[in-house]
Amino acid sequence: CSCAPTHPQTAFCNSDLVIRAKFMGSPEIIETTLYQRYEIKMTKMLKGFDAVGNATGFRFAYTPAMESLCGYVHKSQNRSEEFLIAGRLRNGNLHITACSFLVPWHNLSPAQQKAFVKTYSAGCGVCTVFPCSAIPCKLESDSHCLWTDQILMGSEKGYQSDHFACLPRNPDLCTWQYLGVSMTRSLPLAKAEA
């Protein structure tokens, strides 16, 4: 299986569904197909209201039954642990793969949690996180934000992934914007020396 490194915002925007859910047990092989499915308990939907329509929730997450076909293998045995699942909708079913952005909710920084609930959506369809995996790399468009975590940190999990979103600054320009407290806030006043 091959997976491209993915910024959380890209995962959010490229997914049909983003939910919080708990895995309820071991996967069940679906006979005569190349799939298995995990029973899940959805606790919150963060993206996908339009795509889903009347559906109130998803009982199963479908994934290829083989790792070579990018099948997802759920390793946690803790049924009370809540996961963020960014998946695709196919024939009315939630599909996930080994490449899906799928992490324990508590592993996300508060800034990322807030972004999945609210902020990332503002960049979808407008801005593009453009991966820089080898130097030199340059922006191809003003709507792109250059993602350099792989170069600078040697990993897709870096400062831009954890703390920034690529958002419209104006109709023609996207820039990295800090997800936490404003970086431009004034410093506390220095105490006068005695």
Epitope: C1, S2, C3, A4, D16, T32, T33, L34, Y35, A51, P64, M66, E67, S68, L69, C70, G71, R88, L89, R90, N91, G92, H95, T97, A98, C99
Partner: antibody
Framework: QVQLVQSGAEVKKPGESLKISCKGS????????IGWVRQMPGKGLEWMGI????????RYSPSFQGQVTISADKSISTAYLQWSSLKASDTAMYYC??????????????WGQGTLVTVSS | DIALTQPASVSGSPGQSITISCTGT?????????VSWYQQHPGKAPKLMIY???NRPSGVSNRFSGSKSGNTASLTISGLQAEDEADYYC??????????FGGGTKLTVL
């Protein structure tokens, strides 16, 4: 690097049997599905079936179920496609290819060079 | 099998851009999000050019690009060159995970 090497061209008469092969190298042969694809002269690609050499789990396209047999010998990293009784309409180029996952996609990422089978009286 | 429909032939002059379409029959949401494209020169094995609608494997020219709108995926070749003359096939997979091919499109470079 990943390589799939197929057996050579075959000329057969109707009613004869045939077994063609596809040897994999450069990757873990038992961990990936191998598919067989038919291309009749001047026509498009048709998926025939796939096999998982690790446990010989085999799935056939409905169009080819009962017409051919797909097998594998994992000890020599080789997959096979065989006919018990050939027909003139089996004349075609046959490709083996590795069935693989890319992100959410399922596709054939590496192909053998093809085996031309000619059936004529 | 699910039918993926492609035009039988397209043509273009060197330097031009051409687009080949691949239409699925299902209207299910995301039913054809997953489309790959193969190039096949006469007498040769197919070669993967695009996967997951718009991604290029390493080594494939950036003149090749993929996109999707509604139920139709498209392969666009810009700056057409003589060596692009070949047959092109789209491929997806059905709800069981099994592969499905389009009928193929013959590209002629005039």
């Amino acid at each position: 690097q990943v390589q799939l090497v197929q057996s050579g061209a075959e000329v057969k008469k109707p009613g004869e049997s045939l077994k063609i092969s596809c040897k994999g190298s450069g990757y873990s042969f038992t961990s990936y599905w191998i598919g067989w694809v038919r291309q009749m002269p001047g026509k498009g690609l048709e998926w025939m079936g796939i096999i998982y050499p690790g446990d010989s789990d085999t799935r056939y396209s409905p169009s080819f179920q009962g017409q051919v047999t797909i097998s594998a010998d994992k000890s020599i990293s080789t997959a096979y496609l065989q006919w018990s009784s050939l027909k003139a309409s089996d004349t075609a180029m046959y490709y083996c290819a590795r069935y693989y996952g890319f992100e959410y996609d399922l596709l054939f990422d590496n192909w053998g060079q093809g085996t031309l089978v000619t059936v004529s009286s | 099998d699910i039918a993926l429909t492609q035009p039988a032939s397209v043509s273009g002059s060197p330097g031009q851009s051409i687009t080949i379409s691949c239409t699925g029959t299902s209207s299910d949401v995301g039913g054809y999000n997953y489309v790959s494209w193969y190039q096949q020169h006469p007498g040769k094995a197919p070669k993967l050019m695009i996967y997951d609608v718009s991604n290029r494997p390493s080594g494939v020219s950036n003149r090749f690009s993929g996109s999707k709108s509604g139920n139709t995926a498209s392969l666009t070749i810009s700056g057409l060159q003589a060596e692009d003359e070949a047959d092109y096939y789209c491929q997806s997979y059905d709800i069981s995970g099994y592969p499905v091919f389009g009928g193929g499109t013959k590209l002629t470079v005039l």
